[in-house]
């Protein structure tokens, strides 16, 4: 606790002090007082610089004195042998003795008292800006008239702050202008205009005289303008050094005038006014501004319209124009919006075709669709080339935005059939010779693929099993081969309405309208071993003449086996219907006259014993297209016969083209349309 006075004695005083001692005393008097320390007795071993034994007086970091030896008072009326006066309220006294003393030394006696200090005169730095008043234990500052004491209780200033200017026009000047401004003051003026107006400050050079800068270029007195995060100034000197017109780009401006203790000049005077906040005429690429003006200010509205092929993307919605308003902050609303090239996006993929990954999907880019050749071709034309249009769609010159459609190429086998040796009397064939060939496992029969979703077969094949299992793409019908081939799942079987259903199909003698369609659940993927056969055209070009050659294929009965394991095929000529009538039925279930022959039937065979037989039913009788020799069409379907190895009867497909097309159209999925 601070004390007003106290006594300090060396160890054992007045007896001799011991060797090897170090003792310190921390003296503290109340704040606002100094310390008067005086010694009334001093008897300490003398040495040079008091190196052996000493009493040391320290104030802060300063050594006020170091004492040793013997002292006596110079004044007979005073017992003081040594004294110290410090203007601080703390002092440290340290006594040290070394390991030996040649004589007996008694040490020292000292006293301290708190003394008043004159803060107004005792220090180099004057504590008050104007008037300083000392009192015992402290001081206070005071000010001349019209000045007030700042919160720091040391500095006086003029009360020149707090004014807020809200009018759209006005004038502000330094205190007492044009008389000298007050020293040691900080004047703050605030201009606060309505949002959307910027403060514009106007000065004349001659209306400004403020104490000049020091040699380092720092203003001693200064005028500063602060608008948000922008600062103009500090300014000082004779004549205004800054721009005479200051556009602050803000509706709020703080004016700060700071003066020091010396060098008062006449000060300054300025005018200000509020301008509607200008917005820059921005260069927005690929767009047009409406209305077009040389200058845009607060509350102006423009419509920015994108050029063709450009759009504004906001979130997920694309637009061709947007509105922008000049805002109170001098910035355009919707400034983030830009007219970007229309992006048509990644082009949609198409079934059985592909589109090369485009380098760009922006306006003007070009892509090309191609079909998986040679198994598919582009049905709806247009060449497959699309460009990214201004509306954001990929557009083709012919089809517009409609996508190309890749449909199977029909009637083109990957490898042509070659008869290797003399079905009955036929040759081994490969599925690539007859990629349209479908195998039905129950009953053991055939069919012809006519497109992705449809299989054509004989009505008698499916009348007893409306959920047939079918396979495509395999030359062999051995189980391991079928397991690797494509199994087709039926969705629905459509038997021709003219086909007569019988209680006992085994006794059938009428095979008229022996035709059926099987709609598949899933589309068939075409390739070298799976590909459809064409349908006949309706023109007379597709009327068969006697002697016209056709190909049959299947896994039916051969000379050696009841059922063939590997696909067999034969080339047969068309024959007159009477040739089929003339052949005696091998195992008749009725009179020969009971068997029905109609124009819906084709008779073929009779050459070298080549014929279709049991198990080949439903397979195609494929004839070269008269208008395109590279293609085959299904002229007939294996239907029935009087005797294997002679002549066979085939359903005349041309007579059913209308029914086939109608059935397919009425039972197509949207994907097919």
């Amino acid at each position: 606790e601070p004390t007003m006075y106290g006594e300090i004695l060396s160890p054992n005083y007045p007896q001799a002090y011991p060797s090897e001692v170090e003792k310190s005393w921390d003296i503290e008097v109340p704040e606002g007082y100094g310390i008067h320390l005086y010694f009334t007795h001093l008897d300490i071993e003398l040495s040079e610089n008091c190196a052996y034994d000493s009493v040391q007086i320290i104030s802060g970091d300063t050594e006020e004195g170091r004492l040793c030896g013997q002292r006596s008072s110079n004044n007979p009326h005073s017992p003081i042998v040594e004294e110290f006066q410090v203007p601080y309220n703390k002092l440290q006294v340290i006594f040290k003795s070394d390991f030996s003393n040649e004589e007996r030394f008694t040490g020292f006696a000292a006293y301290y008292v708190a003394t008043d200090i004159n803060e107004c005169t005792d220090f180099v730095d004057v504590p008050c800006s104007h008037f300083c008043n000392n009192f015992i234990g402290g001081y206070f500052c005071s000010c001349p008239p019209e000045y007030f004491l700042h919160d720091d209780m040391k500095n006086c200033g003029v009360n020149c702050s707090g004014d807020v200017f809200t009018a759209l026009i006005g004038e502000i000047a330094s205190p007492n202008y044009p008389k000298p401004y007050p020293e040691n003051s900080r004047c703050e003026y605030q201009i606060r205009l309505e949002k959307g107006f910027q403060v514009v400050v106007t000065l004349r050079r001659e209306d400004f005289d403020v104490e000049a800068a020091d040699s380092a270029g720092n203003c001693l007195d200064s005028l500063v303008f602060v608008a948000g995060d922008r600062q103009f100034g500090p300014y000082c000197g004779h004549g205004f050094p800054g721009p005479l017109n200051i556009e602050t780009k803000s509706n709020a401006l703080d004016i700060i005038f700071q003066t020091d203790l010396t060098g008062q000049k006449k000060g300054w005077k300025l005018r200000y006014h509020g301008d509607p906040m200008p917005c820059p005429k921005e260069d927005t690429p690929n767009s047009v501004w409406e209305p077009a003006k040389a200058k845009y200010v607060f509350r102006d509205v423009v419509q920015i319209t994108c050029l063709d092929g450009f759009e504004v993307v906001e979130g997920r919605v694309g637009a061709t124009s947007f509105y922008s308003t000049c805002q109170s902050n001098g910035k355009w609303s919707n400034s983030k919006l830009k007219c970007q090239p229309v992006d048509c996006g990644i082009p949609e993929s198409i079934e059985n075709g592909k589109v090369e990954d485009p380098e760009s999907t922006l306006f003007g880019s070009v892509i090309r669709y191609t079909c998986e050749e040679p198994y598919y071709y582009m049905e709806n034309g247009g060449g497959g080339e699309y460009h990214c249009a201004g509306n954001g769609s990929w557009v083709n010159e012919v089809l517009g935005p409609e996508l190309p459609k890749c449909v199977p190429v029909c009637g083109v086998p990957r490898e042509p059939f070659e008869e290797k040796q003399r079905i009955i009397g036929g040759s081994d064939a490969d599925i690539k010779n007859f990629p349209w060939q479908v195998f039905f496992d129950n009953p053991w029969a055939g069919g012809a693929l006519i497109n992705e979703y449809w299989v054509l077969t004989a009505a008698h094949v499916v009348e007893g099993n409306r959920e047939p299992t079918m396979y495509v793409g395999s030359t062999s019908v051995q189980t391991s081969r079928l397991a690797k081939s494509k199994m087709l799942t039926p969705e629905h079987v459509f038997i021709h309405p003219g086909w007569k259903l019988l209680e006992v199909p085994e006794g059938r003698t009428n095979f008229d309208n022996d035709i059926a369609l099987v709609r598949l659940k899933d589309p068939v993927k075409m390739g070298p071993t799976v590909s459809p056969i064409c349908l006949p055209g309706t023109s007379s070009d597709y009327n068969l003449m006697d002697g016209d050659l056709g190909l049959i294929s299947g896994w039916g009965r051969t000379e050696k086996r009841d059922r063939a394991v590997r696909l067999k095929a034969a080339r047969l000529p068309v024959a007159p219907l009477r040739k089929c009538k003339e052949v005696k039925v091998e195992k008749p279930t009725a009179d020969a006259e009971a068997y029905v022959f109609t124009p819906n039937m084709i008779c073929a065979g009779g050459e070298k014993g080549m014929d279709s037989c049991k198990g080949d039913s439903g397979g195609a009788f494929a004839v070269q297209d008269p208008n395109d020799k590279t293609k085959f069409y299904a002229a007939g379907l294996v239907s029935w016969g009087p005797q294997c190895g002679t002549y066979g009867l085939y359903t005349r497909v041309k007579n059913y083209v209308d029914w086939i097309m109608k059935t397919m159209q009425e039972n197509s999925t949207p994907r097919e349309d």
Epitope: F439, D441, T479, S480, K560, R561, V565
Partner: antibody, heavy 119, light 107 residues
């Protein structure tokens, strides 16, 4: 109707080889795929391998890889299965079996050949 | 190779019982699974092919079901002639593999 006639029973010493034949009648071997299946006494059926005429390659079960060889002589319609480095665990009835059609795994089975491996 | 796990290995049942044998494939085999019946000293006889198709000449009390990896052979009413060992076999592509067999014996 296909018939398969296999060679007679064999007794072999460990380390030796055995060659079992299977003669096809009622059909030609070229029209068929021949499989070989074995059955150890009191044990289950084990598929050994087959000749795949479509690919013209022989496929063996992993277990017999390197020890079994299946061959065919189409001129005599005879299939052969040779198993080498015989051990006692190879004692079994060996069947030749034709592959079925239209989803049936096996069609005709031979009468079986008992191979006994004993020292 | 695809593994076939057949269960149970042995099954005791009486004439007239409904019997179910299960076969599990280590990976999907679609419907390429058959069931064979074997009697001592005889070659196996095909009952069911393609998981559920009944071979001609096989009594209708035998039925098969399942696809993918889980398959079942059911004998709706066990007859004296049905006491035998039953095997499943998978054949979607080479290699083919048999189950270890289920022996159906008289209780």
């Amino acid at each position: 109707e296909v018939q398969l006639v296999q060679s007679g029973a064999e007794v072999k010493k460990p380390g030796a080889s055995v060659k079992v034949s299977c003669k096809v009648s009622g059909d030609t071997l070229t029209e068929l795929s021949m499989h070989w299946v074995r059955q150890a006494p009191g044990k289950g059926l084990e598929w050994m391998g087959t000749f795949d005429p479509e690919e013209g390659e022989t496929i063996y079960a992993q277990k017999f890889q390197g020890r079994v060889t299946m061959t065919e002589d189409t001129s005599t319609d005879t299939a052969y299965m040779e198993l080498s480095s015989l051990r006692s665990e190879d004692t079994a009835v060996y069947y030749c079996v034709t592959e079925g059609e239209a989803g049936r795994p096996f069609d005709a089975w031979g009468q079986g050949t008992l191979v006994t491996v004993s020292s | 190779d695809i593994q076939m796990t057949q269960s149970p290995s042995t099954l005791s049942a009486s004439v007239g019982d409904r019997v179910t044998i299960t076969c599990r494939a280590s990976q999907s085999i679609s419907s390429w699974l058959a069931w064979y019946q074997q009697k001592p000293g005889k070659a196996p006889k095909l009952l069911i092919y393609k998981a559920s198709s009944l071979e001609s000449g096989v009594p209708s009390r035998f039925s098969g079901s399942g696809s993918g990896t889980e398959f079942t052979l059911t004998i709706s009413s066990l007859q004296p002639d049905d006491f035998a060992t039953y095997y499943c076999v998978q054949y979607p592509s080479y290699s083919w593999t048999f189950g270890q067999g289920t022996k159906v014996e008289i209780k």
